[in-house]
């Protein structure tokens, strides 16, 4: 009686259960009554990452430097190449098909999380007591200077973009 279902790592064709090709190999010929499945290794710059019956291997991803990409992990016959972005850039999608420059946090905002190859800078507004006076992809909000600890007094209040200005205490004459 011909099978209607096959074991794991097999596939059904022409009432025969044929072995799938292992990762890194492509199908050359289905099994028959007389022969086992015939598989061949993927060529240079090709891969297949599953047990399969594909007649063509997939091309490795190309990390295009013109799009700001570079190779993070070289592909093998069983894995695709993994791309990441050049320093100062991050991927525009999970597939990392292109890169954009990391965003800078404007004055009044500080870096909450520094960008990585796959995520952009996360900015946060500087809360009371903190400021940022530069546009930066690295700088956090800095605390206002504590005039008291320097034996000085606040001459000008700080904002989210400026530090306080300290000055000498008025002397009694």
């Amino acid at each position: 009686e011909p099978p209607t279902a096959c074991r794991e790592k097999q596939y059904l064709i022409n009432s025969q259960c044929c072995s799938l090709c292992q990762p890194g190999q492509k199908l050359v010929s289905d099994c028959t009554e007389f022969t086992e499945t015939e598989c061949l290794p993927c060529g240079e710059s090709e891969f297949l990452d599953t047990w399969n019956r594909e007649t063509h291997c997939h091309q490795h991803k190309y990390c295009d430097p013109n799009l700001g990409l570079r190779v993070q992990q070289k592909g093998t016959s069983e894995t695709d190449t993994i791309c990441t972005c050049e320093e100062g850039w991050h991927c525009t999608s999970e597939a990392c098909e292109s890169c954009v420059l990391h965003r800078s946090c404007s004055p009044g905002f500080g870096v909450k999380q520094i960008a990585t190859g796959v995520s952009d800078t996360i900015c946060e507004p500087c809360p009371v007591g903190f400021f940022s006076n530069v546009s930066s992809a690295f700088e956090k909000c800095h605390p206002w200077t504590s005039c008291e600890t320097k034996d000085l007094v606040v001459q000008q209040a700080g904002t989210n973009k400026t530090d306080v200005v300290c000055g000498p205490q008025d002397r009694l004459r």
């Epitope: 022409n14 009432s15 025969q16 072995s19 050359v28 010929s29 289905d30 028959t32 009554e33 007389f34 022969t35 086992e36 015939e38 007649t55």
Partner: antibody
């Protein structure tokens, strides 16, 4: 239905070459190997080799490897076997055959090698 | 090469009687995938071979159930439960586990 139709009988002199054909119909030609089998008069069967029409890959009986060439023309779903440097022992019926979802044989081509 | 030895060479049988043909291989035909690629053919006079059984015991579509195959390793048998007139011809075993594929020398079945 699946059919393998072989070329007609051939008479050749020793040392000559011959090219036999096997035209397939009724199925997707590139999906199955075509194999060639020799049957000398009053003798058993001898496997010569096979060719995968998908990529032209071949496998051979070492005995025939130096003199047999297997090719295909996928545009006309035809497989060929060329036998070179013929000798009298090559006198036989040559069959093409295909298996996978059943086994199919051509009607055979009679080759006579005689001076 | 794997040598396939068939016996008997000739098999005279009375119509309706059973018949049995033996095929022995010089090495095991068990493939690493668990299958045994031993097959049986019939060749009627003046015709192309016709496959009866593949992988020891599987009948091809359209083959009468009076034909059956059995065996394992190196020892195989084709049985015909009740011989009919149309069964006359030469029977071959073959193996496709090892390259080159090889055939038995044939058993000629004739009616007594």
């Amino acid at each position: 239905q699946v059919q393998l139709v072989q070329s007609g009988a051939e008479v050749k002199k020793p040392g000559a070459s011959v090219k036999l054909s096997c035209k397939a119909s009724g199925y997707t030609f590139i999906s199955y190997y075509i194999y060639w089998v020799k049957q000398a008069p009053g003798q058993g069967l001898e496997w010569i080799g096979g060719i995968n029409p998908r990529n032209g890959g071949t496998n051979f009986n070492e005995k025939f490897k130096s003199r047999a060439t297997l090719t295909v023309d996928t545009s006309i779903s035809t497989a060929y076997m060329e036998l070179s440097r013929l000798r009298s022992e090559d006198t036989a019926v040559y069959y093409c055959t295909r298996h996978g979802n059943g086994v199919y044989w051509g009607q055979g081509t009679t080759l006579t090698v005689s001076s | 090469d794997v040598v396939m030895t068939q016996s008997p060479l000739s098999l005279p049988v009375t119509l309706g009687d059973p018949a049995s043909i033996s095929c022995r291989s010089s090495q095991s035909l068990l493939h690493s995938n668990g299958n045994t690629y031993l097959h049986w053919y019939q060749q009627r006079p003046g015709q192309s071979p016709n496959h009866l059984i593949y992988q020891v015991s599987n009948r091809f579509s359209g083959v009468p159930d009076r034909f059956s195959g059995s065996g394992s390793g190196t020892d195989f048998t084709l049985k015909i439960s009740r011989v009919e007139a149309e069964d006359v011809g030469v029977y071959f075993c073959s193996q496709t586990t090892h390259v080159p594929w090889t055939f038995g020398g044939g058993t000629k079945l004739e009616i007594k």
